[in-house]
Interface confidence: low
C-alpha cells in the first residue's frame, strides 16, 4: 500500500528526545482465537448476577472496541428465578492496558494508558451496617 | 531498578525497516490510583463464587505482574455457608493487551500480545445434558 499520510505534528520515530519511547511491533501475537465475549461464553446470561455487555468504541484507542459489563439487577437471582435483594450483584473490575494515539490521529505514535473496565458481575453478601 | 542487559540482536529504534512498528510513550496515563486487586475490593471473599488471586510474574512482559483468579470451589456458597454443587463457580475471563520484549531482554523493543486472564468468578446455573 502507499505510505500513510503523515500528520505534521506527529513525533519523529527517529527523535531520540521523544520522552521514554519504545518501538512496538504491531503484529499481535494472539493466543486466543475468540475475541467476542458474547460468543466466548454465555455466563452473562446464566449467572446468578447476570450482566449486559455494552460496546464502547473509540477510534483513537487500541483496542478500539471494549465490552463493558453492566449488572442487570441490584440483587441476585435465586433458585426460583426471582431477584433476591438480600444479596448484591456487583461488577468485577479489571485494570487493562490500552494504547492512546498521542498526538491525536498520528498513525505511528501512541501513549500507554491504564483504564478500569467492568468484565462481568458476581453475587456478594452485602455489608450490613448496624446503627446503634 | 537496574538497567536491563541489552541483547546484541536488538533492533535499532531508528531502523525504518523494523516491521510494522510504532512509537509508544511509556509515561503511562493512569486513570486509576489503586492497582492491587486485593485492596481494591473484597469481592473475592464475599462472593458466592469466591476466588483466590495468584500472582503471575514475567519480567519479559509489561505489565510484569498480572493477578490471576482461581475459583475456590466447583460449586457456589449457599445461604448456610456451605458449597452447593447444584450451581457452578466459573472464572470470568478477559482478553488483555500486554507488551512482550522481543527479542528478549531488549530495553526498547516490544511486540503486542493478547492474553486471556481470569479476573474473578461468578456463580452460574449448570448446563444439564439429559441422556435419552
Amino acid at each position: 500500500g502507499i505510505t500513510i499520510p503523515r500528520n505534521p505534528g506527529c513525533p519523529n520515530s527517529e527523535d531520540k528526545n521523544f520522552p521514554r519511547t519504545v518501538m512496538v511491533n504491531l503484529n499481535i501475537h494472539n493466543r486466543n482465537t475468540n475475541t467476542n465475549p458474547k460468543r466466548s461464553s454465555d455466563y452473562y446470561n446464566r449467572s446468578t448476577s447476570p450482566w449486559n455487555l455494552h460496546r464502547n468504541e473509540d477510534p483513537e484507542r487500541y483496542p478500539s472496541v471494549i465490552w463493558e459489563a453492566k449488572c442487570r439487577h441490584l440483587g441476585c437471582i435465586n433458585a426460583d428465578g426471582n431477584v433476591d435483594y438480600h444479596m448484591n450483584s456487583v461488577p468485577i473490575q479489571q485494570e487493562i492496558l490500552v494504547l492512546r494515539r498521542e498526538p491525536p490521529h498520528c498513525p505511528n505514535s501512541f501513549r500507554l494508558e491504564k483504564i478500569l473496565v467492568s468484565v462481568g458481575c458476581t453475587c456478594v453478601t452485602p455489608i450490613v451496617h448496624h446503627v446503634a | 531498578g537496574i538497567t536491563i542487559p541489552r541483547n546484541p540482536g536488538c533492533p535499532n529504534s531508528e531502523d525504518k525497516n523494523f516491521p510494522r512498528t510504532v512509537m509508544v510513550n511509556l509515561n503511562i496515563h493512569n486513570r486509576n490510583t489503586n492497582t492491587n486487586p486485593k485492596r481494591s475490593s473484597d469481592y473475592y471473599n464475599r462472593s458466592t463464587s469466591p476466588w483466590n488471586l495468584h500472582r503471575n510474574e514475567d519480567p519479559e512482559r509489561y505489565p510484569s505482574v498480572i493477578w490471576e483468579a482461581k475459583c475456590r470451589h466447583l460449586g457456589c456458597i449457599n445461604a448456610d455457608g456451605n458449597v452447593d454443587y447444584h450451581m457452578n463457580s466459573v472464572p470470568i475471563q478477559q482478553e488483555i493487551l500486554v507488551l512482550r520484549r522481543e527479542p528478549p531482554h531488549c530495553p526498547n523493543s516490544f511486540r503486542l500480545e493478547k492474553i486471556l486472564v481470569s479476573v474473578g468468578c461468578t456463580c452460574v446455573t449448570p448446563i444439564v445434558h439429559h441422556v435419552a
Epitope: 500500500g1 504491531l26 503484529n27 477510534p59 487500541y62 478500539s64 494515539r101 498513525p107 | -
Partner: nanobody
Framework: QVQLVESGGGLVQPGGSLRLSCAAS????????MYWVRQAPGKGLEWVAK????????YYVDSVKGRFTISRDNAKKSLYLQMNSLRAEDTAVYYC????????????WGQGTLVTVSS
C-alpha cells in the same frame, strides 16, 4: 495484491453533495471493517467513518455526523461515502482504508481522492 481505488472526488460548492466510491480487490472484502480517513491540506490525518464487515454498525467522527453516510456492497467489493451539506472544512484528500491489526493503523491505503469545497 491488495488494491483500493477511490473515485468520486472533485470541486463542489458549500452545501453541495458528493458520493465517494472505493473499489477493493485482492482480499476478502466482507471479512474486514472498512474506513474513510481524510487529510486536509497542512493538517493531520483524521478518521472520518467506519463500517463493520457486515454493514451492521457505522461510526462517525462528530464533525460529520448527520451529514456523511458510510455504506458498503460486499457483493461488489465496494465502499461508499455519501457526503451531504459539504463545508469548506471538509476539503481534504479522502482515503479508503482496510483495518486489520490496529484500527487507524492500516495495512493498505488507496491513492486518495481530492474533495474541494469552495464557492
Amino acid at each position: 495484491q491488495v488494491q483500493l481505488v477511490e473515485s468520486g472526488g472533485g470541486l463542489v460548492q458549500p452545501g453541495g453533495s458528493l458520493r465517494l466510491s472505493c473499489a477493493a480487490s485482492g482480499f476478502t472484502f466482507s471479512s474486514y471493517g472498512m474506513y474513510w480517513v481524510r487529510q486536509a491540506p497542512g493538517k493531520g490525518l483524521e478518521w472520518v467513518a467506519k463500517i463493520e464487515q457486515d454493514g451492521s454498525e457505522e461510526y462517525y467522527v462528530d464533525s460529520v455526523k448527520g451529514r456523511f453516510t458510510i455504506s458498503r456492497d460486499n457483493a461488489k467489493k465496494s465502499l461508499y461515502l455519501q457526503m451531504n451539506s459539504l463545508r469548506a472544512e471538509d476539503t481534504a484528500v479522502y482515503y479508503c482504508a482496510k483495518g486489520e491489526i490496529l484500527p487507524l493503523y492500516f495495512d493498505y491505503w488507496g491513492q486518495g481522492t481530492l474533495v474541494t469545497v469552495s464557492s
